[in-house]
Interface confidence: low
């Protein structure tokens, strides 16, 4: 398909044009062709910020222990989540863990468990700001 | 018009440090990426490596652990170190733009002789 | 030795047409573009053509590339005085993951 960007129509190779001397944009990388960049192959590959690359960055596949929360476009990256039941930290590159099936005894259970953190637990009488 | 300018010793000894700077002007040194390539005397022309404008660089393996470039987009300037050189170390540098994997604008170049 | 493989010469007359070879591999000129560069005497390189075929604005149309399989051709057509200079070919090397040049060709444009 034909591009229109800044009233030039380019071909079927997908030019999108960037003044020499300019960044490419998000979803595009810097083309062999002064002047020019080339659009990231959807599901391929992405660039989340203006650049320079020589290739867009590799979508990421999800691994075995996940799911997809969000495919990869040519702007973002796939988004990937652990599967219902387990969890893993925010800042963590561990495997996903199994989730804590209840709190031990004289606590009670404040927060389910979702794909960022395990179950919380506090203890009965302590006044936390939760309604127990 | 985008220009580049190589500047530095040009004569270092043998064994020492040769350092050189490029520095740009008339356009963005954010937007590129920037090599520095060099040619032997009456030889041809070998690539040194490159730079991007966030501090990524790529290195010729020949010359890989001798090598070291840095960029400091404040004062637009790319310089180049070559630790431990040698007489076949002689050489014109040139510093040169890169847009995506062509070199399109060249500095005029600066001698280097290594020689005690 | 250079990884490119270039004549070392080549001459003409004026108005002739001549033809500069660049001989590489499958890790390089087979899967990469090819980039052409003139350095004439006692200046810095100047690139020439770009993207095996493509030539910069102020390049004259004489001069045109091609690439075919692991292999580029300069060809310099309606030679003039001021084409004497060095031509080297240009490329990148995925195995080696960096640019690579041949080692120049130096053309004498005769009487």
């Known amino acids: 398909a034909t591009i229109k960007l800044h009233d030039q129509s380019i071909g079927t190779q997908q030019w999108e044009h960037s003044p020499l001397g300019e960044l490419c944009p998000p979803g595009s990388h810097r083309s062999e062709r002064p002047g020019a960049c080339n659009r990231c192959t959807e599901g391929v590959g992405y660039t989340n910020a203006s650049n320079n690359l020589f290739a867009c960055l590799p979508c990421t596949a999800c691994k075995s222990d996940e799911e997809e929360r969000s495919p990869c476009t040519t702007t973002r990256n796939t988004a990937c989540q652990c599967k219902p039941g387990t969890f893993r930290n925010d800042n963590s590159a561990e495997m996903c863990r199994k989730c804590s099936t209840g709190c031990p005894r004289g606590m009670v259970k404040v927060k389910d468990c979702t794909p960022w953190s395990d179950i919380e637990c506090v203890h009965k009488e302590s006044g936390n700001g939760h309604n127990i | 018009q985008v220009q580049l300018q190589e500047s530095g010793p040009g004569l270092v000894k043998p064994s020492e440090t040769l350092s050189l700077t490029c520095t740009v002007s008339?356009?963005?040194?954010?937007?590129?990426?920037w090599s520095w390539v060099r040619q032997s005397p009456g030889k041809g022309l070998e690539w040194i490596g490159s730079?991007?404008?966030?501090?990524?660089?790529n290195y010729n393996p020949s010359l890989k652990s001798r090598v070291t470039m840095t960029i400091d987009k404040s004062k637009k300037q790319f310089p180049l170190k070559i630790d431990s050189v040698t007489a076949a170390d002689t050489a014109m540098y040139y510093c040169?733009?890169?847009?995506?994997?062509?070199?399109?604008?060249w500095g005029q170049g600066t001698l280097v002789t290594v020689s005690s | 030795s250079y990884v490119l493989t270039q004549p070392p010469s080549a001459s003409g007359t004026p108005g002739q047409r001549v033809t500069i070879s660049c001989a590489g591999s499958s890790s390089n000129i087979g899967g990469n573009t090819v980039n052409w560069y003139q350095q004439l005497p006692a200046t810095a390189p100047k690139l020439l053509i770009y993207s095996n075929n493509q030539r910069p604005s102020g390049v004259p149309d004489r001069f045109s590339g091609s690439k075919s399989g692991t292999s580029a051709s300069l060809a310099i057509s309606g030679l003039q005085s001021e084409d004497e200079a060095d031509y080297y070919c240009a490329t990148w090397d995925d195995s080696r993951g960096g640019w690579v040049f041949g080692g120049g060709t130096k053309l004498t444009v005769l009487g």
């Open positions: 730079i991007d404008y966030a501090g990524s660089t």
């Open positions: 008339g356009g963005s040194i954010s937007d590129y990426y």
């Open positions: 040169a733009r890169q847009l995506g994997r062509i070199s399109d604008y």
